[in-house]
């Protein structure tokens, strides 16, 4: 392990389309990948009229967008489907939306998901 970096070995797993994709619905996913590459966790969700609907959560392969992020935060302004990634075991249990806007002050919308 590299000092100061969170190694990701497992992530919270959730799949809203578990029947169609023939997977489990919820659980803990062990993260596999090439031995020298970094591993991350991710979360994707939709905001339907203020109601949070989780799409998927799981492991994500080596991605510089996720390096050294201990929290799962979507920064893109108003995406259709929200996506965030992070490093550290189960770091995708909580996720939030914190858009990077140039003029207006960003607002944080932390979410503690409760999968159905």
């Amino acid at each position: 392990a590299i000092l100061g970096r969170s190694e990701t070995q497992e992530c919270l797993f959730f799949n809203a389309n578990w029947e169609r994709d023939r997977t489990n619905q919820t659980g803990v996913e062990p993260c596999y990948g090439d031995k020298d590459k970094r591993r991350h966790c991710f979360a994707t969700w939709k905001n339907i009229s203020g109601s949070i609907e989780i799409v998927k959560q799981g492991c994500w392969l080596d991605d510089i967008n996720c390096y050294d992020r201990t929290d799962c935060i979507e920064k893109k302004d108003s995406p259709e489907v929200y996506f965030c990634c992070c490093e550290g075991n189960m770091c995708n249990e909580k996720f939030s939306y914190f858009p990077e806007m140039e003029v207006t002050q960003p607002t944080s919308n932390p979410v503690t998901p409760k999968p159905p």
Epitope: Y32, D34, K37, F42, T44, V55, K56, G58, C59, W60, L61, D62, D63, I64, N65, K76, P79, E80, V81, Y82, F83
Partner: antibody, heavy 115, light 111 residues
Framework: QVQLVQSGAEVRKPGSSVKVSCKAS????????INWVRQAPGQGLEWMGT????????SYAQKFQGRVTITADTSTSTAYMELSSLRSEDTAVYYC????????WGQGTLVTVSS | QSALTQPRSVSGSPGQSVTISCTGT?????????VNWYQQHPGKAPKLMIY???KRESGVPDRFSGSKSGNTASLTISGLQAEDEADYYC???????????FGGGTKLTVL
């Protein structure tokens, strides 16, 4: 082992469209990006665009904006690249590649545009 | 999204070292450690050799190494072997907020 298997060669007329598929196996399809790259005969590699299969979010090279559409079907672990308004200069081998680092590549699909 | 600049060709004798350069801008090559190197033999798909500027892909011999200074990345192949004769491309990580771009390619001839 990780494999990306692409659809077979295509011949198209100028002005038409082509859709190339890329079926992934040996890893979790929703755990990384799929990128598309093309290579014209005797030429270099050209990045076309990328998709995040889990969110459906895409980014396209400026050159192809408006002409290329990249999609992904998570139920079949397959990514697609559709290029429209084809011209002879689009004759090339089209590759899909896994992840931001392009660590695994498909075998390539030759698309020939000819009248 | 302009293509990165590589020399068209380089050559070397077996056992020698060669270096291939890849020059870009502060927003691609100079931005973080985004540069990768690919080897392509005729009629074959490209193969990732070096990623993140200097990390060797699994299974790649340690004769291949990568480095970066400012907006120029370099691939060095030491102890040249006949099978190293191929086209080499530099490229950048693509995904999320990053767009991809490749160099024009360098033909390596082993004399």
């Amino acid at each position: 082992q990780v494999q990306l298997v692409q659809s077979g060669a295509e011949v198209r007329k100028p002005g038409s469209s082509v859709k190339v598929s890329c079926k992934a196996s040996g890893y979790t399809f929703t755990s990384s990006y799929i990128n598309w790259v093309r290579q014209a005969p005797g030429q270099g590699l050209e990045w076309m665009g990328t998709i995040n299969p889990v969110s459906g979010s895409t980014s396209y090279a400026q050159k192809f904006q408006g002409r290329v559409t990249i999609t992904a079907d998570t139920s079949t672990s397959t990514a697609y690249m559709e290029l429209s308004s084809l011209r002879s200069e689009d004759t090339a081998v089209y590759y899909c590649a896994r992840g931001g680092w392009f660590d695994y590549w498909g075998q390539g699909t030759l698309v020939t545009v000819s009248s | 999204q302009s293509a990165l600049t590589q020399p068209r060709s380089v050559s070397g004798s077996p056992g020698q070292s060669v270096t291939i350069s890849c020059t870009g801008t502060s927003s691609d090559v100079g931005s973080y450690n985004r540069v990768n190197w690919y080897q392509q033999h005729p009629g074959k798909a490209p193969k990732l050799m070096i990623y993140g500027v200097s990390k060797r892909e699994s299974g790649v011999p340690d004769r291949f190494s990568g480095s970066k200074s400012g907006n120029t990345a370099s691939l060095t192949i030491s102890g040249l072997q006949a099978e190293d004769e191929a086209d080499y491309y530099c490229g950048t990580f693509a995904g999320g907020r990053y767009y991809g771009v490749f160099g024009g390619g360098t033909k390596l001839t082993v004399l």
